[in-house]
Interface confidence: low
């Protein structure tokens, strides 16, 4: 039975050209985390494997940094980075847990005026 829950940073906004940390945390389970995948829509961004360490997809290796922890740091943000991000925890014996983060990348002037992304 899967008892765990994923806590994420939820819906976040960041400034174009800046950086952001995507964080997920698996709690309420004693299952062993074997691998965490970070995905953006149809694209695998990064893998953190318990045995093999980090792997960053080629198209993103210069803009994505592993960590902190099992999180992911996105750098040199563009408006095209706006969208859904998923942390997928592969665990034993529970199976797979998935967390969702929505990132909105704002033009600098918009960000400076305190605009926030909110789901209605």
């Amino acid at each position: 039975m899967m008892t765990g829950t994923i806590e994420t940073t939820g819906n976040i906004s960041a400034e174009k050209g800046g950086s952001i940390i995507l964080q997920c945390h698996l709690s309420s389970t004693t299952a062993q985390v074997t691998q965490v995948n970070w995905e953006q829509q149809d694209q695998l961004l990064a893998i953190c494997n318990a045995d093999l360490g980090w792997h960053i997809s080629p198209s993103f290796k210069d803009r994505v940094a592993p960590g902190p922890g099992l999180g992911l740091t996105l750098q040199s943000l563009t408006v095209n980075d706006t969208g859904e991000y998923f942390c997928i925890y592969h665990t034993y014996p529970d199976g797979t847990y998935t967390g969702r983060i929505f990132l909105e990348v704002l033009e600098s002037s918009v960000a400076e005026h305190g605009a926030r992304f909110q789901i209605p």
């Epitope: 792997h55 080629p58 210069d62």
Partner: antibody, heavy 115, light 107 residues
């Protein structure tokens, strides 16, 4: 939905030239590495060329077998990938695939070099 | 250039059986390895990237393992639709070389 569609293949004489195109849709083209891969009939896949994304200055890399004869390029405004092939040889006959980082491939286009 | 060696050109396996396809790199590729499945007349299909990560929609009977220079694709409970040629590819350093392929057949 990510789509890659190759065109421009066909029959060409040895020593001739051909330009392959790969029209793409469903993703932000300039964000991704793009490649060309070929497969001669009944043989293995061969990686040919790579053009990196905007973040990496659209720099290119080639396999030894095509370096100096083939040129990979991209039109980011039209989301099209190209492969200019010059001084073609019989051994260049193959199905040519364009591919996007992340495992997306076109259906392939046949190029036959023969007199 | 990094050479990728798939030692078995052909493998014959019983339906429902387990098969292991190996791929050896001539130098360390730090898990930057992909496995592709190709059926006649079709483009290759990405199964696994980063040596271990199963692509969305790929059945869980496929798995990848390995590190350093040695990598493995395993298929359990072999199905008829798994009959295909399997290629490994390193993308640690250009040129991003492929293995010569392993053709899987049903015994």
């Amino acid at each position: 939905e990510v789509k890659l569609v190759e065109s421009g293949g066909g029959l060409v004489q040895p020593g001739g030239s051909l330009r392959l195109s790969c029209a793409t849709s469903g993703f932000t083209f300039s964000d991704y590495y793009m490649s060309w891969v070929r497969q001669p009939p009944g043989k293995a896949l061969e990686w040919l060329a790579l053009i990196r994304n905007k973040a990496n200055g659209y720099t290119t890399e080639y396999s030894v077998s095509v370096k100096g004869r083939f040129t990979i390029s991209r039109d980011n405004s039209q989301s099209i990938l190209y492969l200019q092939m010059n001084t073609l040889r019989a051994e260049d006959s193959a199905t040519y695939y364009c591919a996007r980082d992340g495992g997306y491939w076109g259906q392939g286009i046949l190029v036959t070099v023969s007199s | 250039d990094i050479q990728m060696t798939q030692s078995s050109s052909y493998l014959s396996v019983s339906l429902g059986g387990r098969v292991t396809i190996t791929c050896k790199a001539s130098d360390h590729i730090n898990n930057w390895l992909a496995w592709y499945q190709q059926k006649p007349g079709n483009a290759p299909r990405l199964l696994i990237s980063g040596a271990t990560s199963l692509e969305t929609g790929v059945p869980s009977r496929f798995s990848g393992s390995g590190s350093g220079k040695d990598y493995t694709l395993s298929i359990t409970s072999l199905q008829t639709e798994d009959v295909a040629t399997y290629y490994c590819q390193q993308y640690w350093s250009t040129p991003f070389t492929f293995g010569s392929g392993t053709k899987l057949e049903i015994k």
